[in-house]
């Protein structure tokens, strides 16, 4: 058993049929010695008396808010949550496996630049009785500071019969140098509590591997005289690291017809302009990627050919 | 990335072309190592990230762009020497850039070159003959060192009398390639920045 926060405790339960459970001793936080009784949740049934209560925690029915009283007055509370191991594996029931980039990916993180700021998000089908708390650090043995905000509900989607909820959190490394070469990964730890179930999820990454630039901005077309060609120009996104001559991007320019089946013309360039042939009803899209370290491409920025 | 590659202008900052070739060569070598050594811990998640140049060179700090010198987090060990040297700088206004930067890059390359050559000698003794260092990568390191044109003592290749542990050598190769790729990215950024200045 360990303390998650004041008066909230997590009991680690290795569950299997007929498992003996965990013996837990609760102590009433009071100078009083006599006349103390214990109850669980809203029930008035007295579970025991005395300054300590010994319970055998075998299942979720044994978890909840234990309260010690004296003469109708509440002395203290202890909320017991369960962290369950089934078949030797800690439960991961609260969050959905996003399966990208690999199985058992519950947390996904992205950074728009090298400033040390990043966003992580996760999915769940649970809509109520749910809380998250996020901690992060650079490295684990001698951790350096990363500050994370509160996790917030960022999107809701309907997936078949189910509603899916997306939560996200923003974190910032306390002293980040954009030019630094990372040798210790960022560690992100999410504590999830649903009803009386506690679970924890972790992700470990280098900022360089989660970079995804914003799409190029100010995408413009300039028709070239007496030609079907156009000059496409764009700019680096505002959120990208500076100076741009050091943090350079490379770009992919795509001409796409109305139908998805039509052949796409693609050009790769390090410049912020390109000359392409604009077909009728086609659109021109540009996306960006770090020129030197191939992490994710940005989303496309698009303009119609007409 | 299999992207069309533009050939640099002849008047371009001479080291940029070499540094681009270096990054391409080390990335290809790392990819080859990951594939060939698929049953060894050779991915970024599996290896220990060690830097053989740590405490010996200060490339990141010495080559910091001017715009980042205002960032306190980048300044732990920044040395501010604005003297210029080396043939890469021949035709450029480089008052902002330090000789320290390019000599630090040169020292990095020299250290990695020695390590790679020593390691290749061991890998050539492996009866499995599973993986060797790409000669192109070694040649590209050499070309960039020559372009940097810093005179420094030749470091003798390390020789070892004991029987090499081929498993350890292959893991060390992965560690070295990952670290060298990260350094090659920094070198490319620096050269791009110098070229634009």
């Amino acid at each position: 058993i360990w303390e998650l926060k004041k008066d909230v405790y997590v009991v680690e339960l290795d569950w299997y049929p007929d498992a003996p459970g965990e013996m837990v001793v609760l102590t009433c936080d009071t100078p009083e010695e006599d006349g103390i009784t214990w109850t669980l949740d809203q029930s008035s049934e007295v579970l025991g008396s005395g300054k300590t209560l010994t319970i055998q925690v075998k299942e979720f029915g044994d978890a909840g808010q234990y309260t010690c009283h004296k003469g109708g007055e509440v002395l203290s509370h202890s909320l017991l949550l369960l962290h369950k191991k089934e078949d030797g594996i800690w439960s991961t029931d609260i969050l959905k496996d996003q399966k990208e980039p690999k199985n058992k990916t519950f947390l996904r993180c992205e950074a728009k630049n090298y400033s040390g700021r990043f966003t992580c998000w996760w999915l769940t089908t649970i809509s109520t009785d749910l809380t998250f708390s996020v901690k992060s650090s650079r490295g684990s043995s001698d951790p350096q500071g990363v500050t994370c905000g509160a996790a917030t509900l960022s999107a809701e989607r309907v997936r078949g019969d189910n509603k899916e909820y997306e939560y996200s959190v923003e974190c910032q490394e306390d002293s980040a140098c954009p030019a630094a070469e990372e040798s210790l990964p960022i560690e992100v730890m999410v504590d999830a509590v649903h009803k009386l179930k506690y679970e924890n999820y972790t992700s470990s990454f280098f900022i360089r591997d989660i970079i995804k630039p914003d799409p190029p901005k100010n995408l413009q077309l300039k028709p070239l005289k007496n030609s079907r060609q156009v000059e496409v120009s764009w700019e680096y996104p505002d959120t990208w690291s500076t100076p741009h001559s050091y943090f350079s991007l490379t770009f992919c320019v795509q001409v796409q017809g109305k139908s998805k089946r039509e052949k796409k013309d693609r050009v790769f360039t390090d410049k912020t302009s390109a000359t392409v042939i604009c077909r009728k009803n086609a659109s021109i899209s540009v996306r960006a990627q770090d020129r030197y370290y191939s992490s994710s491409w940005s989303e496309w920025a698009s303009v119609p050919c007409s | 990335r299999n992207l069309p590659v533009a050939t640099p202008d002849p008047g371009m900052f001479p080291c940029l072309h070499h540094s681009q070739n270096l990054l391409r060569a080390v990335s290809n070598m790392l990819q080859k190592a990951r594939q060939t050594l698929e049953f060894y811990p050779c991915t970024s998640e599996e290896i220990d990230h060690e830097d053989i140049t740590k405490d010996k060179t200060s490339t990141v700090e010495a080559c910091l762009p001017l715009e980042l010198t205002k960032n306190e987090s980048c300044l732990n060990s920044r040395e501010t020497s604005f003297i210029t040297n080396g043939s890469c700088l021949a035709s450029r206004k480089t008052s902002f850039m330090m000789a320290l930067c390019l000599s630090s890059i040169y020292e990095d390359l020299k250290m990695y070159q020695v390590e790679f050559k020593t390691m290749n000698a061991k890998l050539l003794m492996d009866p499995k003959r599973q993986i060797f260092l790409d000669q192109n990568m070694l040649a590209v390191i050499d070309e960039l060192m020559q372009a940097l044109n810093f005179n420094s003592e030749t470091v003798p290749q390390k020789s070892s009398l004991e029987e090499p542990d081929f498993y350890k050598t292959k893991i060390k190769l992965c560690i070295l390639l990952h670290a060298f790729r990260i350094r090659a990215v920094t070198i490319d950024r620096v050269m791009s920045y110098l070229n634009a200045s």
């Epitope: 569950w15 299997y16 049929p17 949740d41 075998k58 299942e59 979720f60 029915g61 369950k84 089934e86 078949d87 029931d93 089908t125 649970i126 078949g160 019969d161 189910n162 649903h194 009803k195 009386l196 179930k197 | -």
Partner: nanobody, 123 residues
Framework: EVQLVESGGGLVQAGGSLRLSCAAS????????MGWFRQAPGKEREFVAQ????????YYADAVKGRFTISRDNAKNTVSLQMNSLKPEDTAVYYC????????????????WGQGTQVTVSS
């Protein structure tokens, strides 16, 4: 909203068998732990059995262990309770319930409930 409909109840002699079924609709059933409870006349509702969502691990009340078997079919969105060696004290209304806490024998840990099906065991 989730609907649970029980079926398979009836009158059976002591020592006999019955198979109860519960069909779920309205939400993806595979994301829940399923359980059966029962309520005998004049008594509190009590836990019978539960099956977990992933690996179909099972949890039984001591009174039914070795006689009752709970199983689930995620493709058909059903959970079943095979009751063998029935005793008169098994007479009750049997309720199907789903929740997100496994293992739990506590009523309030379940989110959705069926209407119940009557099982009567005569001696």
């Amino acid at each position: 909203e989730v609907q649970l409909v029980e079926s398979g109840g009836g009158l059976v002699q002591a020592g006999g068998s019955l198979r109860l079924s519960c069909a779920a609709s309205g939400r993806t059933f595979s994301g829940y732990d399923m359980g059966w409870f029962r309520q005998a006349p004049g008594k509190e509702r009590e836990f019978v059995a539960q099956i977990s969502r992933h690996n179909s691990n099972t949890y039984y009340a001591d009174a039914v262990k070795g006689r009752f078997t709970i199983s689930r079919d995620n493709a058909k969105n059903t959970v079943s309770l095979q009751m063998n060696s029935l005793k008169p004290e098994d007479t009750a209304v049997y309720y199907c319930a789903i929740g997100s806490l496994f293992p739990s024998s506590r009523e309030r840990d379940y989110d959705y409930w069926g209407q119940g099906t009557q099982v009567t065991v005569s001696s």
